[in-house]
């Protein structure tokens, strides 16, 4: 099976690696235009100049391209408490990270959000906090993990999932609230 | 105690159009971003769009961009998400949050209401 090619893609594999086909005339191969660039005029024949531009200030291009248009440069997303990496240039787009003892969560492929890294407390570090992954935390004996913190057993109702790490704990509750009724 | 109460969904027709309320109370609504997730029948959770307190520079997901706005009052704590051009891969529960801040979670979201995109 041959696999479904774009339009824009079809049209390229006429031609060698770092041209494009004239969308006017398919018997002539332009040269892209290099990343930081992007296609002002298609060359007007075979051998011949395409006429790329340099980007404007707030846009880039990331790779040999024959775009007509620069991409916009991202923005890093100040509600989401992300922070600037590094900064737009002509030939790459805006890095957008965390700030230190933080990390990514990806909500979506585009879209992430920076949180705290968990400290463990009432417990002990499993998995150290990574870039895009919170720290793994162990509870110690009398705690259970809830939303990655360490809470008491004592806020364990029967209805939730630490009934069974707790199990001692609600027994032993449990045990007491019954030794208390006649 | 913060309450968060959606309304204006329903069926309509694939190309037709809704617009989607949320009646905000219980914090400084003006402080807060402000997002809309949906959850298609059998699928997870998609975050669709969020707005910053000053209403500026949304954020909408590849797959509404161009189609739906989102917007603000903050004199009525009230949000909005207007959907156009409406597509089938539009019908879910729409529910509006407060953007998570301790973790990825949701702490405070409405109950939701149905959209449903068919002829």
């Known amino acids: 099976l041959v696999p479904h090619l774009g339009d824009r893609e079809k049209r390229d594999s006429v031609c060698p690696q770092g041209k494009y086909i004239h969308p006017q005339n398919n018997s002539i191969c332009c040269t892209k235009c290099h990343k930081g660039t992007y296609l002002y005029n298609d060359c007007p024949g075979p051998g011949q100049d395409t006429d790329c531009r340099e980007c404007e200030s707030g846009s880039f291009t990331a790779s040999e391209n024959h775009l007509r248009h620069c991409l916009s440069c991202s923005k890093c997303r100040k509600e989401m408490g992300q922070v600037e990496i590094s900064s737009c240039t002509v030939d790459r787009d805006t890095v957008c990270g965390c700030r230190k003892n933080q990390y990514r969560h990806y909500w979506s492929e585009n879209l992430f959000q920076c949180f705290n890294c968990s400290l463990c407390l009432n417990g002990t570090v499993h998995l150290s906090c990574q870039e895009k992954q919170n720290t793994v935390c162990t509870c110690h004996a009398g705690f259970f993990l809830r939303e990655n913190e360490c809470v008491s057993c004592s806020n364990c109702k029967k209805s939730l999932e630490c009934t069974k790490l707790c199990l001692p704990q609600i027994e032993n509750v449990k045990g007491t609230e019954d030794s208390g009724t006649t | 105690e913060v309450q968060l109460l959606e309304s204006g969904g329903g069926l309509v027709q694939p190309g037709g159009s809704l617009r989607l309320s949320c009646a905000a109370s219980g914090f400084t609504f003006a402080h807060e971003t402000m997002v809309w997730v949906r959850q298609a029948p059998g699928k997870g959770l998609e975050w669709v769009s969020h707005?910053?307190?000053?209403?500026?520079?949304?954020f909408y997901a590849d797959s509404v961009k161009g189609r739906f706005t989102i917007s603000r009052d903050n004199s009525k704590n009230t949000l909005y998400l207007q959907m156009n051009s409406l597509r089938a891969e539009d019908t879910a529960v729409y529910n509006c949050a407060l953007l998570p801040k301790r973790g990825p979670w949701f702490d405070y979201w409405g109950q939701g209401t149905l959209v449903t995109v068919s002829s």
């Open positions: 707005i910053p307190p000053d209403g500026q520079d949304p």
